[in-house]
């Protein structure tokens, strides 16, 4: 009897183990005792990335401008084309199907990371002695003014969105 | 260890007969077909035989069909080639090769080999 | 039966070099080819099979490229234990053929 399973990147059909078509081609006909699997290379808008059976190729993805997408790396016979977001958006999905604006961090927040093709931004909250009074996704936190340094006094003291005010010392006469 | 070990080569008159042994070790023998390969002196490889996992599957070269016979013992992990009326012109090393495949004697590749044994016919 | 050849017959280069081989087939094969090496009184080893799959061990400098009917061995930079010679064959029909072999010499 025929056996049940065929070594790796091979098929059983007909009592044949069939080798697979190799990534970036497609199956044409199955082996038979005397000829091997017929296989033909995927065109040049297609591809197939794995040891396959397949009898057609799949089409690369399509980065829609229209959608905010634009083309990271071409695709090959054996890759699809990888698609990311235009400048100012970032993908929706790990597949990366449509784009969305980044996010700003609002007042009292700072951008712990910038925003990529394929992530949004990071906020952080602003800790004790630092600061941020925009709406940005670009902005870090920022330090507190030093009122020493400059030789002057905290007269209005800093939150989480707002800076210290400096004013001078009380001179004693 | 993985290995082939053919033996029964030797110098043989023409028209007389001999028998080749490959011995098998390492690899589960009856999970792939098996072949002959032979090289004349200081010539290119020639595929002689192949014999699938089964024996159900069985071919030859041209050159030598109706002379040799494959065959190979699972039990034993031995693949055996009976050569008769040999002709000068079967003069060669004659390896036995593993093919990572299983279903036909016909086609197929090598991806383990003997170190082979000298056949000379020769008066 | 399909015919291989083999070009060139043999090729003198130094340690360092790359070396190309060529294999042309007398009917498409897809990619159903292998390439092997032999030195003097051993036996044939695999490199490559499916035109472009390295075989386990082997080393990366070692590449196959092509489909159909043309395919290409190359070696990117020859070391002193590749001087042998090299070997094509198609498994895409009956029966399996070789070509002539390429003889890799030192220049």
């Known amino acids: 009897e025929p056996p049940t399973a065929c070594r790796e990147k091979q098929y059983l059909i007909n009592s044949q183990c069939c080798s697979l078509c190799q990534p970036g081609q497609k199956l044409v006909s199955d082996c038979t005792e005397f000829t091997e699997t017929e296989c033909l290379p995927c065109s040049e808008s297609e591809f197939l990335d794995t040891w396959n059976r397949e009898t057609r190729c799949h089409q690369h993805k399509y980065c829609d401008p229209n959608l905010g997408l634009q083309v990271q790396q071409k695709g090959t016979s054996e890759t699809d084309t990888i698609c990311t977001c235009e400048e100012g958006l970032h993908c929706t999905s790990e597949s990366c199907e449509s784009c969305v604006p980044h996010r700003s961090c609002l007042p009292g927040f700072g951008v712990k990371q910038i925003a990529t093709g394929v992530s949004d931004t990071i906020c952080e909250p602003c800790p004790v002695g630092f600061f941020s009074n925009v709406s940005s996704a670009f902005e870090k936190c920022r330090p507190w003014t030093s009122c020493e340094t400059k030789d002057l006094v905290v007269q209005q003291a800093g939150t989480n969105k707002t800076d210290v005010v400096c004013g001078p010392q009380d001179r004693q006469r | 260890e993985v290995q082939l070990v053919e033996s029964g080569g030797g110098l043989v008159q023409p028209g007389r007969s001999l028998r080749l042994s490959c011995a098998a070790s390492g690899f589960t023998f009856d999970d792939y077909a098996m072949h002959w390969v032979r090289q004349a002196p200081g010539k290119g490889l020639e595929w002689v035989s192949g014999?699938?996992?089964?024996?159900?599957?069985?071919h030859y070269a041209d050159s030598v069909k109706g002379r040799f016979t494959i065959s190979r013992d699972n039990a034993k992990n031995s693949l055996y080639l009976q050569m008769n009326s040999l002709r000068a012109e079967d003069t060669a090393v004659y390896y036995c090769?593993?093919?990572?495949?299983?279903?036909?004697?016909?086609?197929?590749?090598?991806?383990?080999w003997g170190r082979g044994t000298l056949v000379t016919v020769s008066s | 039966d399909i015919q291989m050849t083999q070009s060139p017959s043999s090729v003198s280069a130094s340690v360092g070099d790359r070396v190309t081989i060529t294999c042309r087939a007398s009917k498409v094969i897809s990619s159903w080819l292998a390439w092997y090496q032999q030195k003097p009184g051993k036996a044939p080893k695999l490199l490559i099979y499916?035109?472009?799959y390295l075989e386990s061990g082997v080393p990366s400098r070692f590449s196959g490229s092509g489909s159909g009917t043309d395919f290409t061995l190359t070696i990117s930079s020859l070391q002193p234990e590749d001087f042998a010679t090299y070997y094509c064959q198609q498994h895409s029909s009956f029966p399996p053929t070789f070509g002539g072999g390429t003889k890799v010499e030192i220049k």
């Open positions: 499916a035109a472009s």
């Open positions: 090769a593993k093919d990572p495949t299983a279903t036909t004697g016909a086609r197929g590749y090598f991806d383990l």
């Open positions: 014999i699938s996992w089964s024996s159900d599957s069985i």
